[in-house]
């Protein structure tokens, strides 16, 4: 018995708006009704929680009101993206999914994706 | 899956000593990182230490007084605590993790990472 598969990218380039979509998916060995899914952000030997949503299969997913996550769910696959990323956010962002409902509970933590956040470079004053 | 018991909790002297265990069952504990955690009334849960195959990793407030190892036979972790003080007092929960390659001696104990946690069992440093 290993822990539960996760699988995500290995790296993702932000957008100039700031925004990075990456694909979590999970390998699950029963039938799990309720899931969590928690991004968390390794850098500099601090580990932060970005968002988090718990979700019912065949549902939304669904997090907080001020939540700089987004992300839609289909089968065992989670479609997350993060927006109003800058620079200083570059870091591994990882997928953490635990099978919540029904019994036995399930964790697997993915091997993490690198997202590169590059800050657009100001526009030139224009005299037009 | 993984199911985790924890025992060996209760009351013991300032000075003295208690070990925790922590068993396995369903999985060989080899793929996880095991941790101990600890809530006092009215704080945040936090980092006791935890140990992988080859690493072990301590909060700065317990180094040199406990101990953690395990015996993959038994598919048990151990905290042994000595030195015991009065902050010590505590719900001690043990937790696993998945082993994973960018864990750094900083982060492998981060309570972010942990699932499969126990009910906690409490230890107490009174006279």
């Known amino acids: 018995c290993k822990a539960m598969h996760v699988a995500q990218p290995a790296v993702v380039l932000a957008s100039s708006r700031g925004i990075a979509s990456f694909v979590c998916e999970y390998a699950s060995p029963g039938k799990a009704t309720e899931v969590r899914v928690t991004v968390l952000r390794q850098a500099d030997s601090q580990v932060t929680e970005v968002c988090a949503a718990t979700y019912m299969m065949g549902n939304e997913l669904t997090f907080l009101d001020d939540s700089i996550c987004t992300g839609t769910s289909s089968g065992n696959q989670v479609n997350l993206t993060i927006q109003g990323l800058r620079a200083m956010d570059t870091g591994l962002y990882i997928c953490k999914v635990e099978l919540m409902y029904p019994p036995p509970y399930y964790l697997g933590i993915g091997n993490g994706t690198q997202i590169y956040v590059i800050d657009p470079e100001p526009c030139p004053d224009s005299d037009f | 899956e993984v199911q985790l018991v924890e025992s060996g909790g209760g009351l013991v002297q300032p000075g003295g000593s208690l070990r925790l265990s922590c068993a396995a069952s369903?999985?060989?504990?080899?793929?996880?990182?095991i941790g101990w955690f600890r809530q006092a009334p009215g704080k945040e849960r936090e980092t006791v230490a935890c140990?992988?195959?080859?690493?072990?990793s301590y909060a700065d407030s317990v180094k040199g007084r406990f101990t953690i190892s395990r015996d993959n036979a038994k598919n048990t972790v151990y905290l042994q605590m000595n030195s015991l003080r009065a902050e010590d007092t505590a719900v001690y929960y043990c937790?696993?993790?998945?082993?994973?390659?960018?864990?750094?001696?900083?982060?492998?104990?981060?309570?972010?990472?942990?699932?499969?946690w126990t009910q906690g069992t409490q230890v107490t440093v009174s006279s």
């Open positions: 937790a696993a993790s998945p082993d994973k390659p960018f864990y750094t001696d900083q982060t492998m104990c981060n309570k972010h990472y942990y699932g499969y």
């Open positions: 140990i992988n195959r080859s690493r072990t």
């Open positions: 369903g999985s060989t504990l080899d793929p996880f990182v």
